[in-house]
């Protein structure tokens, strides 16, 4: 019936052409370059928080949109005027022609134009909505920017105050360090003064010692003189006694000279009828040399020679080789009988060794070795033990086979360290081994976690320092 065509002319304006019979109607409509067509998809700018668009750019875009709006409005007005003008012209033509069918065409054209106008209006409404959306988005972005800016400003203020605090603290510490340096210098000076004073004191003491040594020499000389006098007196007394006994013998021949009895060990003392605990004088085997020892005449049948006792920490056991050789301490209290005597004694016949132990909780235990002897001094009084029984552990806390004896001045252990110096006291150290009954004496509540205490590992562990210990020997055939 009719042909309606839409095309673009060479200058980019939209061209509407209506063909009806022999008549052709062409309408040229102005096209706005800045107006986005409804068919093209709208792509919004994805805005992320804290990554704002430039404020000036947003303002510029708003201005562009306002211009577009204004242009569109003008264009609508022009369109309306254009349509009205055309309508007037068409009406005059219609009236002049007075042709019925042309009226219908004009009505149709009018309808088309109205439809187009409606479509344009709808497009404009869309554009307006888009502009509003964009404006809202921009406002939100601006709000976000301002919030972000406030947040940053707050953070900067916080950091600034923190920096100020740190600076204050730093200056305070600097002052403190300077004060400490001053104090340190003063202390160093006082230490130096003390050192000088001590050196003076030491030199004074040295001179006093020298004087004392001279006095000792003099005293020794005097002592020798006194000893000679005493010897002479004794000889005189003996002569007198001899004379008296001779004269008495002449008068009473029944009086015999009293025999001097000597005992090798406490077993012999016991067998001679002395069954009371106490200190007795013993004689070295094959010698006239004497030694005082404590004899236990009650425990386990009696006859025990006590060779070591610890009970109260009253005696220092960090002694020299010579002191351990000859013995030290008090036989009625803490003491060491002496390695030389024990070595000579235990090499004469078979001896048993009993070690009696007490802890701080009231418990007692013992280790009994059915064979015991000490080697000679040439072999560093090496201990030899066999046949372990008792309640203080099924494994011997004195390393087997026995080790050499070590003291602070005689290092014979199997350690690159010096066990005697490290653990204190003389003992048959291994490297350094599971026992040391001659270690430091620690009182109750200070006796745990002590590596250098009185130790018997296979009864109480490595860090426990015992309350009391007794080492005693007796012939195996007693």
């Amino acid at each position: 019936y009719n042909n309606f065509r839409k095309s673009m002319d060479s200058i980019g304006k939209k061209q509407y052409q209506v063909q009806h019979g022999s008549c052709s109607y062409t309408f040229l409509l102005p096209e706005m370059d800045n107006c986005r067509s409804s068919s093209s998809p709208y792509v919004s700018n994805a805005v992320q928080r804290d990554a704002p668009l430039e404020y000036d750019d947003s303002v510029q875009r708003l201005q562009v949109l306002e211009n577009i709006m204004e242009n569109n409005t003008q264009w609508l007005m022009k369109l309306e005027n254009y349509i009205q003008d055309n309508m007037k012209k068409e009406m005059v033509e219609i009236q002049q022609n007075a042709v019925q069918n042309q009226t219908a065409v004009m009505i149709e054209i009018g309808t088309n134009l109205l439809n187009q106008t409606a479509e344009q209006t709808r497009k404009l409404t869309d554009v307006e909505a888009q502009v509003l959306n964009q404006t809202t988005r921009l406002e939100l972005q601006l709000l976000e920017h301002s919030l972000s800016t406030n947040k940053l400003e707050k953070q900067i203020l916080d950091q600034t105050s923190e920096i100020n605090k740190l600076q204050d603290k730093n200056s305070f510490l600097e002052k403190k360090v300077l004060a400490m340096e001053d104090k340190h210098i003063i202390q160093l000076q006082s230490i130096k003064e003390e050192k000088d004073q001590l050196q003076v004191l030491v030199s004074k003491q040295n001179s006093i010692i020298e004087e004392l040594e001279k006095k000792i020499v003099t005293a020794t000389v005097n002592n020798s003189v006194l000893q000679k006098q005493q010897h002479d007196l004794m000889e005189t007394v003996n002569n007198l006694l001899t004379m008296m006994s001779t004269s008495n013998s002449a008068k009473d021949p029944t009086v015999a000279k009293e025999e001097q009895i000597s005992f090798r060990d406490c077993a012999e003392v016991f067998k001679s009828g002395h069954t009371t605990n106490g200190i007795y004088t013993l004689t070295f085997p094959n010698s006239t040399e004497e030694i005082k020892a404590y004899c236990d005449m009650e425990a386990g049948g009696g006859g025990w020679t006590i060779i070591q006792r610890r009970e109260d920490g009253s005696v220092d056991f960090q002694r020299t080789w010579k002191e351990y050789k000859v013995g030290f301490g008090n036989p009625s209290g803490e003491y060491w009988l002496g390695n030389e005597f024990v070595s000579q004694l235990t090499n004469q016949q078979r001896y048993v060794l009993k070690i009696h132990l007490k802890d701080w909780e009231g418990n007692e235990a013992y280790s009994l070795y059915e064979h015991f002897y000490l080697s000679s001094e040439e072999l560093n009084y090496r201990i030899h033990l066999k046949g372990l029984t008792g309640t203080a552990g099924k494994i011997s806390s004195i390393s087997q086979p026995g080790n050499d004896f070590s003291t602070k001045d005689g290092d014979n252990d199997k350690c690159i360290c010096k066990c005697s110096q490290m653990l204190t006291g003389g003992w048959w150290f291994d490297a350094c081994g599971p026992s040391n009954l001659n270690g430091m004496y620690y009182p109750q509540r200070q006796n745990t976690n002590k590596f250098n205490g009185i130790k018997w590992y296979y009864w109480k562990g490595s860090g426990y320092s015992l309350k009391a210990t007794t080492m005693m020997i007796r012939p195996a055939d007693f």
Epitope: N347, E370, H371, Y373, S375, S376, E378, L379, R382, H384, K386, G387, L388, T389, K394, I395, S396, Q400, P401
Partner: antibody
Framework: VQLQESGPGLVKPSQSLSLTCTVT???????YAWNWIRQFPGNKLEWM?????????SYNPSLKSRISITRDTSKNQFFLQLNSVTPEDTATYYC??????HYVSSMDYWGQ | SIVMTQTPKLLLVSAGDRVTITCKAS??????VAWYQQKPGQSPKLLIY???NRYTGVPDRFTGSGYGTDFTFAISTVQAEDLAIYFC?????????FGGGTKLEIK
Amino acid sequence: VQLQESGPGLVKPSQSLSLTCTVTGYSITSDYAWNWIRQFPGNKLEWMGYISYSGSTSYNPSLKSRISITRDTSKNQFFLQLNSVTPEDTATYYCARSTFGHYVSSMDYWGQ
Amino acid sequence: SIVMTQTPKLLLVSAGDRVTITCKASQSASNDVAWYQQKPGQSPKLLIYYASNRYTGVPDRFTGSGYGTDFTFAISTVQAEDLAIYFCQQDYSSPPTFGGGTKLEIK
């Protein structure tokens, strides 16, 4: 420490077996006990006796009547004499040092 | 005298195996028990003394334990060179006595 046995390989029944053990690297008078042990065919081991560093001796009761262990300290040697031997005494004879001087003990050094 | 009963008499093992030998004393021997190794044509060598003490230079694959009458000797990982006869010995009372021996053979 080294120990070396020496003596005749064959002894006629009823005669005496005499063996020597020469010790090098340690003085037999210093410490320890110096033993004689024998091993019968079938690998059974028997301790015979020792002489201690001090010169005291100890013997296996099963041999007591016919065994004697002596020493020569100047040569650092000790000796075994077993009298009235029989074919039952056929064995490998070892000398050895024990770790205890006055009593029987484990033996840490053996002859060849 | 104390009789030492050693078991087993023979052990057939492969290299890498763990082996255990036991010795039972007829009366208490305290901890005075030693273990020896005798390789073919050689004299016995001390491995363990006082029941559990490893002798100088003895590899730690050899271990001993026990007290009183029951004693155990073990080789954790048998090696070819461990082919030998192993003896236990008590020296708690005189005369010292030996076990009958355990022959260790490698498959």
